[in-house]
């Protein structure tokens, strides 16, 4: 008898885009409309929830902009939370200080991306220092991952 | 009889580098010499042409520089075009404003990278706002993707 | 008789983090503690040593910061060395000039990431122009790759 057809495993992947009704940290994300992807990973209250242990490439971009530069320090973090551990683990972080000319309209992006060994039930989030300076266009601010 | 040898599928991948004879948008790319990769994907008039539907990680870096900073707004976009759709879709974008000190020699990069579900016949391109401010060194300005 | 169990090949992957006792170029990396990954790739004197020819996604982020901006040109390079070739090959590079306001405390990141065809025995390194301006926090400065 011929072997059973190979079961094509669904690729674990996510690409979430900026959601302008984020009011506090962590950032919240669009998980349904537009160029969004969510397969084999869950989205819950701003976080991507891992359901299979393994190696993942995780990335995020945040687009900061303002009308009148006052050089507030900017930070952009991808961090991990797991009920087994008491503290959040910062996986990747970008910081900016003294990045624009005082009083001028300004714009700048922060990009992060790297490989991590994630465990089932890990929750991944994105945090920024100045929510009011984030622009949430889907092409400009996003958060994603895929299992290697 | 033993089963036929497994057919190792060619990885769909591209890494194209800056081409200084770009005169208009979209940017054109070096697809032959140097650290270039092009396998299972076609290059046509500045665009990467997808020939198999699936999930792809797409990335681009552009290196902007100038001699007497005027702070012209800079933008760097990766966008998609498909004959089925009337309009280009901006997949990823970076913008910079007020990024250098007036009159000074300056240099800055923009990096973009994320996962997308692409369809056979999609054409991917890179656009910049100020072509004259782009430096096309192969290590500095590039455009690539690979199928997950 | 049933076929032998499939041998699950170990994924070739590395994620190394900043090591503050770097004294000269190339940068040295933490390869043991924290959120480090090293599997199927060797680490030797600042370099990742490839032991299987193939396609790899290679990335690095460097976090530069200073107490009093004097706009020293910053560069961040990922380069490759192989005993067969006389010269280092710069794979990816980021440069920054005129990026902060003179005299101010400042901070800025450079991110690089792309796909390359690497050969067994290739050594990959990271170089920066101003070692004293690099901050080596594990979440901020890192170097990694994975085989596609």
């Amino acid at each position: 008898p011929s072997p059973p057809p190979e079961k094509k495993e669904l690729r674990k992947v996510a690409h979430l885009t900026g959601k302008s009704n984020s009011r506090s940290m962590p950032l919240e994300w669009e998980d349904t409309y537009g160029i969004v992807l969510l397969s084999g990973v869950k989205y819950k209250k701003g976080g991507l929830v891992i359901n299979e242990t393994g190696l993942y490439f995780v990335y995020s971009k945040v687009y900061f902009r303002g009308q009148s530069c006052n050089n507030l320090p900017l930070s952009h973090k991808v961090y991990m939370r797991n009920s087994k551990y008491p503290q959040d683990l910062v996986m990747m972080e970008g910081k900016m200080m003294s990045y624009c000319t005082t009083g001028q309209m300004w714009a700048r992006s922060s990009y992060l991306g790297a490989v991590f060994n994630l465990t089932s039930a890990d929750h991944l989030y994105v945090n920024v220092s100045e929510l009011s300076l984030v622009n949430f266009e889907e092409s400009q601010t996003f958060f994603g991952l895929y299992k290697l | 009889p033993s089963p036929p040898p497994e057919k190792k599928e060619l990885r769909k991948v591209a890494h194209l580098t800056g081409k200084s004879n770009s005169r208009s948008m979209p940017l054109e790319w070096e697809d032959t010499y140097g650290i270039v990769l092009l396998s299972g994907v076609k290059y046509k008039k500045g665009g990467l042409v997808i020939n198999e539907t699936g999930l792809y990680f797409v990335y681009s870096k552009v290196y902007f520089r100038g001699q007497s900073c005027n702070n012209l707004p800079l933008s760097h976009k990766v966008y998609m075009r498909n004959s089925k759709y009337p309009q280009d879709l901006v997949m990823m974008e970076g913008k910079m404003m007020s990024y250098c000190t007036t009159g000074q020699m300056w240099a800055r990069s923009s990096y973009l990278g994320a996962v997308f579900n692409l369809t056979s016949a999609d054409h991917l391109y890179v656009n910049v706002s100020e072509l004259s401010l782009v430096n096309f060194e192969e290590s500095q300005t590039f455009f690539g993707l690979y199928k997950l | 008789p049933s076929p032998p169990p499939e041998k699950k090949e170990l994924r070739k992957v590395a994620h190394l983090t900043g090591k503050s006792n770097s004294r000269s170029m190339p940068l040295e990396w933490e390869d043991t503690y924290g959120i480090v990954l090293l599997s199927g790739v060797k680490y030797k004197k600042g370099g990742l040593v490839i032991n299987e020819t193939g396609l790899y996604f290679v990335y690095s982020k460097v976090y530069f910061r200073g107490q009093s901006c004097n706009n020293l040109p910053l560069s961040h390079k990922v380069y490759m060395r192989n005993s067969k070739y006389p010269q280092d090959l710069v794979m990816m590079e980021g440069k920054m000039m005129s990026y902060c306001t003179t005299g101010q405390m400042w901070a800025r990141s450079s991110y690089l990431g792309a796909v390359f065809n690497l050969t067994s025995a290739d050594h990959l390194y990271v170089n920066v122009s101003e070692l004293s301006l690099v901050n080596f926090e594990e979440s901020q400065t890192f170097f990694g790759l994975y085989k596609l």
Partner: antibody, heavy 119, light 111 residues
Amino acid sequence: QVQLVQSGAEVKKPGASVKVSCKGSGYTFTDYTIHWVRQAPGQGLEWMGVISTYQGDASYNQKFKGRVTMTVDKSTSTVYMELSSLRSEDTAVYYCARFPDWDYAMDYWGQGTLVTVSS
Amino acid sequence: EIVMTQSPATLSVSPGERATLSCKASQSVDYDGDSYMNWYQQKPGQPPRLLIYAASNLESGIPARFSGSGSGTEFTLTISSLQSEDFAVYYCQQSRELPYTFGQGTKLEIK
């Protein structure tokens, strides 16, 4: 064709201020910074500062800091250079010149404005 | 600031002959493979005119008898065969960093 046209000659008393204009035409005005260079009679060239025609902010030679102000009026494609607390050694021809950000040098210059400071 | 020193202050050459003008910078004006050194010509009552940019590149519309060379701190402007219209003052200028600085000029006069 590209032109930078400067305002006419001025005679000023010591302690006064002078405002010289430079109007660009024949090119996209906001794509180029404008630099100011002066030349005292029989002397060499001295760089005074530069203004971003797009953003409107300026960088000045420390030697003139506090005395020079450069401004831009995008609506008329005109840049202004004001020098205050004039002294006799400020007597010079003042030039504006445009600088393409993507290039290496000041490629077009105004015709110059003679400012004479005399009591 | 970078100090530019030109020599000689005055150069007397006959028409048709070759003229070599020198410019030294107090520190290197090179960066990333380029030399940020420019040469200008100025005639009485006129603004300076760009001749050579980035040490050795001829500005469009400038005759090929003008050439520039050098890197780091030492640069040369050469006029291969002097024409009557070439007698003027020549300035070198660095655009490596602000404040931009000029040499004091070399006056090229008819011998």
